[in-house]
């Protein structure tokens, strides 16, 4: 049976049986989610012309998707491990409602969308174990999330396609920045 993260299997002496380090696990986790996003983006781009939309059209959205900024301490200049880790966790928690929205947006990649969502939950757990300052992490309000979800689902088809595209693009960018930052920690 699989060995739960952070535990050892019966063969304690065998070096390979030592569990993956926290960094190894997080790295694999993010790379896997990025791979899943790539599959979802492929279906989205094949289904609609959103991927060819101009930057101006993309900018005209009222989604409040998490984004890395200089002040978050995740970039090479002004890098701050603790501030950055808080930003990554907070951002991932904020993305969860958008990942929930994606669940009914795919036909051939429905299982892949679920895998991305579940893998993100596991990633959040790993990162929370790594963080020292959990008090600084703000969890999104469930009521606000529920009304946001309802609002997104009530959009017309074109806006729903645009929203799906924007979520996937932003989540990919956020994870790529997170991966670069976490590799410095």
């Amino acid at each position: 049976a699989p060995v739960p993260p952070g535990e050892d299997s019966k063969d304690v002496a065998a070096p390979h049986r030592q569990p993956l380090t926290s960094s190894e696990r997080i790295d694999k986790q993010i790379r896997y989610i990025l791979d899943g996003i790539s599959a979802l983006r492929k279906e989205t781009c094949n289904k609609s012309n959103m991927c060819e939309s101009s930057k101006e059209a993309l900018a005209e959205n009222n989604l409040n998707l998490p984004k890395m900024a200089e002040k978050d301490g995740c970039f090479q200049s002004g890098f701050n491990e603790e501030t950055c880790l808080v930003k990554i966790i907070t951002g991932l928690l904020e993305f969860e409602v958008y990942l929930e929205y994606l669940q009914n947006r795919f036909e051939s990649s429905e299982e892949q969308a679920r895998a991305v969502q579940m893998s993100t939950k596991v990633l959040i757990q790993f990162l929370q174990k790594k963080a020292k300052n959990l008090d600084a992490i703000t969890t999104p309000d469930p009521t606000t999330n529920a009304s946001l979800l309802t609002k997104l689902q009530a959009q017309n088809q074109w806006l729903q396609d645009m929203t799906t595209h924007l979520i996937l693009r932003s989540f990919k960018e956020f994870l790529q920045s997170s991966l670069r930052a976490l590799r410095q920690m």
Partner: nanobody
């Protein structure tokens, strides 16, 4: 329970080639990353290469251009084609499967690769 069985290890001369195989038996989630780690005596375990169920690959810098990882999802098998082998590649190679939707993983027992003249 999932069992990972490696094969293909052995003794090879510098510059030679080997192909490792790892077959997973049992109930395996199709959302996974299969890969290879290695451990040389007195050294830290290191990732050699891995591949997602969609075929996206990742390699250690030390093996890029020499090693190729591939997989057959229908057989739950991962392969490592090792070319231009160097004495530094001598190690026990372990097959590893990681399940991102749960965070669990499985290990094989390992296969010895020795590169020596």
């Amino acid at each position: 329970a999932v069992q990972l069985v490696e094969s293909g290890g052995g003794l090879v001369q510098p510059g030679g080639s080997l192909r490792l195989s790892c077959a997973a038996s049992g109930s395996i989630s199709r959302f996974n990353i299969m890969g290879w780690y290695r451990q040389a005596p007195g050294k830290q375990r290191e990732l050699v290469a891995d591949i997602t169920n969609r075929g996206t690959t990742n390699y250690a810098d030390s093996v890029k251009g020499r090693f190729t990882i591939s997989r057959d999802n229908t057989k739950n098998t991962v392969y490592l084609q090792m070319n231009s082998l160097k004495p530094d590649d001598t190690a026990v190679y372990y097959c590893h499967t990681y399940y991102p939707t749960t965070g669990f993983d499985d290990w094989g027992q390992g296969t010895q690769v020795t590169v020596s003249s």
